[in-house]
C-alpha cells in the first residue's frame, strides 16, 4: 500500500481467482484513543472499533472511503483504491491502446518545435467518475523539471456503438535547450482513477522523436508564362523553431488529381518554392519535415490548381 | 580545414558532408537487421557517448561568439562514432550485408573529422566505452542503439554547419 495523495491510498493486488489479497491496517488521524468506530462509504454498518482497523483487501468491494467516527463526529477519511496486477502485468483497463506506433501505446505525444513544449493525449470509452493527474520530468534518476497543466477533455468521437473521449495535456520543459542533443528522455507519467480503480501509464521519449511541424503557411501559386507549369511558394510555419538557417526544414510537394487513383507527382526540396505542372482539377499540397532528423511529416497544406 | 585556434572551417564542405551523414545514418538504421529488441531495450547504452550539450556552444549564439568549442565537441563525437562503427559491434556476428551503408557511414565520419582537424593538431578524443557484447543479439541491439544515437548527434552537427555556412562563411 502507498499514498497517492493526502488520505488516498493505493493497494496493489495480485488479481486471480482465490487470491489471498493484502492485509491493510488503517489508522485514524486523531489524538483520540477511545470510542472510535469505522464505516465504509455510505454504509452505517460498523466494521470495527479502535484507533486502527485491520482489513483484508481482496476485491473492489473492500475498497472505498473508510471513515473513523467518534460520537457521530467524523474524525478522518482514508480512500482505498485498487491497482490490479494480472499475471505479473498491471491492468490497463481505463485507457484505450492506440496501437500507433506500436501495440501497448496508451499515451501519444507530439511537439511542434524544439522549445521543450509538447502535448500528450490519450483515449478512453469511460465518461464518468474519471480523474487524471500528469507528472513529467527529463530523466528519471536525477530528474529535471517539466511542468504540465491539467488534463482536459479535448475531443469526443462516436466509434460504432461506443463514444470515445480524448484527453490531452500540455507540458513545458523548465530549462529547455533547443539546440542541444538530448541525452536523457522526457518521462511522462499519468495516474488514472476510475471509481475505485487506479492505473498508471508512462511514456518515455526524446523531443526530437515526437517533432511534427505545423503545415507550411502562405502556400501560393504563380503561373509561369506560356507554360502549364506553376511556381509554388510557401513559408516556414510560425510555430517552427528559429533561426531557420539552424532549424531547417525539408519539404515534399505533391500534385494530386481529383481521383485518389490518379498518379501523384512528388518533388522533394529544401527550398521554399518549387516548379510543378498543374493539371486541371488537381490540387497542390506541401508538407514539412525536420531536414536533418526523420521525425514526422507535418499535415499537408493544399491549394487547388485552378 | 578547421584550424583550432581561430580560422574558420570550410563551412560549406562541412555542411554538405554532414547532411550526407544524416542521410546515411537513417538509411543504415533499418538495414542492420530485423529488430524487436529495440522496442524493449530501455536502458541507455549511450550515456558514455559524447553528446552535444547545452554548454558546448553549438547554439546559434554560441557559434557566433566562438565556434571552436562546438567544433571541438563535434570532432570528438565523430572520432568516437568512427571507432564504434569499426569495432567488433559492427564487424562481428551477425555480419552486415556487403552493400550496407554502415561502411559508407564509417568513411564519411572519418572524412568530416579530417575536414575539422588539420594534420599536426590534436584535440583530445574520448575513450570508447566497454559495451562488451558477447552474443549476436546483443551486438544487434547495440547497433540499433548506436545508430539511433548517431542520428541525433549528426542532426545537431548538420544544423551547426548549415547555420555556419549561411551566416559565418567568409
Amino acid at each position: 500500500i502507498w499514498e497517492l495523495k493526502k488520505d488516498v491510498y493505493v493497494v496493489e493486488l495480485d488479481w486471480y481467482p482465490d487470491a489471498p489479497g493484502e492485509m491493510v491496517v488503517l489508522t485514524c488521524d486523531t489524538p483520540e484513543e477511545d470510542g472510535i468506530t469505522w464505516t465504509l462509504d455510505q454504509s452505517s454498518e460498523v466494521l470495527g472499533s479502535g484507533k486502527t482497523l485491520t482489513i483484508q483487501v481482496k476485491e473492489f468491494g473492500d475498497a472505498g472511503q473508510y471513515t473513523c467516527h467518534k460520537g457521530g463526529e467524523v474524525l478522518s477519511h482514508s480512500l482505498l483504491l485498487l491497482h490490479k496486477k494480472e499475471d505479473g502485468i498491471w491492468s490497463t483497463d481505463i485507457l484505450k491502446d492506440q496501437k500507433e506506433p506500436k501495440n501497448k501505446t496508451f499515451l501519444r505525444c507530439e511537439a511542434k518545435n524544439y522549445s521543450g513544449r509538447f502535448t500528450c493525449w490519450w483515449l478512453t470509452t469511460i465518461s464518468t467518475d474519471l480523474t487524471f493527474s500528469v507528472k513529467s520530468s527529463r530523466g528519471s534518476s536525477d530528474p529535471q523539471g517539466v511542468t504540465c497543466g491539467a488534463a482536459t477533455l479535448s475531443a469526443e468521437r462516436v466509434r460504432g456503438d461506443n463514444k470515445e473521449y480524448e484527453y490531452s495535456v500540455e507540458c513545458q520543459e523548465d530549462s529547455a535547450c533547443p539546440a542541444a542533443e538530448e541525452s536523457l528522455p522526457i518521462e511522462v507519467m499519468v495516474d488514472a482513477v476510475h471509481k475505485l480503480k487506479y492505473e498508471n501509464y508512462t511514456s518515455s521519449f526524446f523531443i526530437r522523436d515526437i517533432i511534427k511541424p505545423d503545415p507550411p503557411k502562405n502556400l501560393q501559386l504563380k503561373p509561369l508564362k506560356n507554360s502549364r507549369q506553376v511556381e509554388v511558394s510557401w513559408e516556414y510555419p510560425d510555430t517552427w523553431s528559429t533561426p531557420h538557417s539552424y532549424f531547417s526544414l525539408t519539404f515534399c510537394v505533391q500534385v494530386q488529381g481529383k481521383s485518389k487513383r490518379e498518379k501523384k507527382d512528388r518533388v522533394f526540396t529544401d527550398k521554399t518554392s518549387a516548379t510543378v505542372i498543374c493539371r486541371k482539377n488537381a490540387s497542390i499540397s506541401v508538407r514539412a519535415q525536420d531536414r536533418y532528423y526523420s521525425s514526422s511529416w507535418s499535415e499537408w497544406a493544399s491549394v487547388p490548381c485552378s | 580545414r578547421a584550424v583550432p585556434g581561430g580560422s574558420s572551417p570550410a563551412w560549406t564542405q562541412c555542411q554538405q558532408l554532414s547532411q550526407k551523414l544524416c542521410t546515411l545514418a537513417w538509411s543504415a538504421h533499418p538495414l542492420v537487421g530485423h529488430m524487436d529488441l529495440r522496442e524493449e531495450g530501455d536502458e541507455e547504452t549511450t550515456n558514455d557517448v559524447p553528446h552535444i550539450q547545452c554548454g558546448d556552444g553549438c547554439d546559434p549564439q554560441g557559434l557566433r561568439d566562438n565556434s571552436q568549442f562546438c567544433l571541438q565537441r563535434i570532432h570528438q563525437g565523430l572520432i568516437f562514432y568512427e571507432k564504434l562503427l569499426g569495432s567488433d559491434i559492427f564487424t562481428g556476428e551477425p555480419s552486415l550485408l556487403p552493400d550496407s551503408p554502415v561502411g559508407q557511414l564509417h568513411a564519411s565520419l572519418l572524412g568530416l573529422s579530417q575536414l575539422l582537424q588539420p594534420e599536426g593538431h590534436h584535440w583530445e578524443t574520448q575513450q570508447i566505452p566497454s559495451l562488451s557484447p558477447s552474443q549476436p543479439w546483443q551486438r544487434l541491439l547495440l547497433r540499433f542503439k548506436i545508430l539511433r544515437s548517431l542520428q541525433a548527434f549528426v542532426a545537431v552537427a548538420a544544423r551547426v554547419f548549415a547555420h555556419g555556412a549561411a551566416t559565418l562563411s567568409p
Epitope: - | D36, E40, E93, W137, L141
Partner: antibody, heavy 121, light 111 residues
C-alpha cells in the same frame, strides 16, 4: 515448415569420437544459428555449443577441448564432433535452432526430436 | 557460468488452479534492458518446447494461460489455470552469457 533431424551412431565405445549430423529444412543456415543441447537419462538440459550464421562458434567451456561444430550451408547440415567419449556422455543429443537474433535474444525456438547416444564398451 | 536455480523442484496443483514457478539467476541476465531469459516445457519422450522468450513474450501458438515476468535475476513462469495437458517439466534458460545455461527443471503434476 521448419524441421531439424539428428542422425548418427546410437552406440559409441569409450575413447571413441562421436559424429552427429543435423539436417535442417524450412530455413537457411545463413540466417539462423544452430546449437547442440544434450540431456542425460532422467536429468536436465546442458548446452554444448553453437554455430553462428557466419560460421563462428562458441562452446561450453567444460567440454570445449573435445568439441567441434561445423556446417555446410549448401547441404543445410551441421556436424557435431565430440572426441574421447565417456559413459557419462550417454544422453539424448538435440540439434536446436536459435530464434531470430533481433527478436528472440538467444531463445531456441525449434528443436529436433533428438538422438540417443549410449557410450559403453 | 551463470547458475539458474528453479523453485520448487516439483509442484502439484489442482486442475483450473494457478501454478507459479520461479527461476533465480546467480547474476543478472539483462543486457541494456533486455532480459535474455526463456522458458521451455518438456513432456515425457518429447523435445523441449519454447513457451516464453525474453522473460515475458508468449511464443506463437502457446495458450495465453502461460505468462512470464521478471527482470535481472528473478523470473516467474505462471500458468493461470492448469490444464491436464500442462503436466510436464518446465525449464528456464539464459542466453546472456556463454555458456547458455538451463535451470534444473520443475515438475508440474495434477493434485
Amino acid at each position: 515448415q521448419v524441421t531439424l533431424k539428428e542422425s548418427g551412431p546410437v552406440l559409441v565405445k569409450p575413447t571413441e569420437t562421436l559424429t552427429l549430423t543435423c539436417t535442417v529444412s524450412g530455413f537457411s543456415l545463413t540466417s539462423y544459428a544452430i546449437s547442440w543441447v544434450r540431456q542425460p537419462p532422467g536429468k536436465g538440459l546442458e548446452w554444448l555449443g553453437v554455430i553462428w550464421t557466419g560460421g563462428g562458434t562458441n562452446y561450453n567451456s567444460g567440454i570445449k577441448s573435445r568439441l567441434t561444430i561445423s556446417k555446410d550451408n549448401s547441404k543445410s547440415q551441421v556436424v557435431l564432433t565430440m572426441t574421447n567419449m565417456d559413459p557419462v556422455d550417454t544422453a539424448r543429443y538435440y540439434c536446436v535452432r536459435e530464434g531470430d537474433y533481433g527478436s528472440y535474444a538467444g531463445a531456441m525456438d525449434y528443436w529436433g526430436q533428438g538422438t540417443t547416444v549410449t557410450v559403453s564398451s | 557460468d551463470i547458475v539458474l536455480t528453479q523453485s520448487p523442484d516439483s509442484l502439484a496443483v489442482s486442475l483450473g488452479q494457478r501454478a507459479t514457478i520461479n527461476c533465480r539467476a546467480s547474476e543478472s541476465v539483462d543486457y541494456y534492458g533486455i532480459s535474455s531469459m526463456h522458458w521451455f516445457q518438456q513432456k515425457p519422450g518429447q523435445p523441449p518446447k519454447l513457451l516464453i522468450y525474453r522473460a515475458s513474450n508468449l511464443e506463437s501458438g502457446i495458450p495465453a494461460r502461460f505468462s512470464g515476468s521478471g527482470s535481472r535475476t528473478d523470473f516467474t513462469l505462471t500458468i493461470s489455470s492448469l490444464q491436464a495437458e500442462d503436466v510436464a517439466v518446465y525449464y528456464c534458460q539464459q542466453a546472456n552469457k556463454d555458456p547458455y545455461t538451463f535451470g534444473g527443471g520443475t515438475k508440474v503434476e495434477i493434485k
